[in-house]
């Protein structure tokens, strides 16, 4: 079995303010079991954007239904984009752990740029 890879196919995405951003992410394996999280930025100060396992993320919807069997698509949509949302977004696979899940592998990142609404 080949080791799981996290694929973020878009290096950059440009979205107009007020629109919805789609950030694409797929994984290449069902192994290891564990959730996906999305972050803006890297390192200890990164901001959690979406956690498949738990939390409330009212601006985020998933593109695919993650409960469906063998799902490997963990793309998300972020609604009502503002300039403050600009940054690099990372799709990160976690491995089931006890008591806490453990970070396993990150995608290469997608840079979100926001185009101002024409006045």
């Amino acid at each position: 079995e080949e080791e799981l890879q996290v694929i973020q196919p878009d290096k950059s995405v440009l979205v107009a303010a007020g629109e919805t951003a789609t950030l694409r992410c797929t994984v290449t394996s069902l192994i290891p079991v564990g959730p996906i999280q999305w972050f803006r930025g890297a390192g200890p100060g990164r901001e959690l954007i979406y956690n498949q396992k738990e939390g409330h993320f009212p601006r985020v919807t998933t593109v695919s239904d993650s409960t469906k069997r063998n799902n490997m698509d963990f793309s998300i949509r972020i609604g009502n984009i503002t300039p403050a949302d600009a940054g690099t977004y990372y799709c990160v696979k976690f491995r089931k752990g006890s008591p806490d899940d453990v970070e396993f592998k990150s995608g290469a990142g997608t840079e979100l740029s926001v185009r101002a609404k024409p006045s």
Epitope: E1, L30, I31, V33, G34, Q52, K53, E54, G55, D65, S66, T67, K68, R69, N70, N71, K96
Partner: antibody
Framework: QVQLVQSGAEVKKPGASVKVSCKAS????????INWVRQAPGQGLEWIAM????????HYNQIFKDRATLTTDTSTSTAYMELRSLRSDDTAVYYC????????????WGRGTLVTVSS | DIVLTQSPDSLAVSLGERATINCRAS??????????IFWYQQKPGQPPKLLIY???NLDSGVPDRFSGSGSGTDFTLTISSLQAEDVAVYYC????????FGQGTKLEIK
């Protein structure tokens, strides 16, 4: 961490119905399947059915299709299994279990609810 | 429905020795490169505990003396060096289609 807390033991007469509850915490209830499994005294494990709380999609073991009904209450993160037309051979411990990988497996289990059917 | 048959029904092994439990499916449980077999351990008075998923992957926190192997229809759970705390009933389960369990194998110390 993930916890599944089941309702207490029940004693029922033949022909009656029972409804067992399973309250989930430590994760987003709508993101993972819930399975129900039973175990008669001194016997093996028998899969009953499963439910996706996000859309109430269900799959049943044919043996239980006419007598069991799975439901969920997403407002309280609780899953329910109702079994009707009880017989003495339905006496068993009934478990709920959460599928963390959408593999139709059982990663986290409740402690079980003993249902005794006796006249 | 796919039927899983475990062998043996019961097994007695000396401490420190290897224990092997087999699970045979009535038809292949493989799909898209994965083997949809899971192994559980159940101790008296407790719910089952997942040990192995997709035939050969150790679940979180499971000691590495446990291993799983096999493909298609024939699968094996191996405990490389039996410890006293491994006394339990072991079940295989498939999810190639709707889940079913094997009948269980009771593991005791010789």
């Amino acid at each position: 961490q993930v916890q599944l807390v089941q309702s207490g033991a029940e004693v029922k007469k033949p022909g009656a119905s029972v409804k067992v509850s399973c309250k989930a915490s430590g994760y987003t209830f709508t993101n993972y399947w819930i399975n129900w499994v039973r175990q008669a005294p001194g016997q093996g494990l028998e899969w009953i059915a499963m439910i996706d709380p996000s859309d109430s999609e269900t799959h049943y073991n044919q043996i239980f299709k006419d007598r069991a009904t799975l439901t969920t209450d997403t407002s309280t993160s609780t899953a329910y299994m109702e079994l009707r037309s009880l017989r003495s051979d339905d006496t068993a411990v009934y478990y709920c279990a959460m599928d963390y990988g959408s593999l139709y497996a059982m990663d986290y289990w409740g402690r079980g609810t003993l249902v005794t059917v006796s006249s | 429905d796919i039927v899983l048959t475990q062998s043996p029904d019961s097994l007695a092994v000396s401490l420190g020795e290897r224990a092997t439990i087999n699970c045979r499916a009535s038809k292949s449980v493989s799909s898209s490169g994965y083997n949809y077999i899971f192994w559980y351990q159940q101790k008296p008075g407790q719910p089952p505990k997942l040990l192995i998923y997709l035939a050969s992957n150790l679940d979180s926190g499971v000691p590495d003396r446990f291993s799983g192997s096999g493909s298609g229809t024939d699968f094996t759970l191996t405990i490389s060096s039996l410890q006293a705390e491994d006394v339990a009933v072991y079940y295989c389960q498939h999810s190639r289609d709707l889940p079913t369990f094997g009948q269980g194998t009771k593991l005791e110390i010789k």
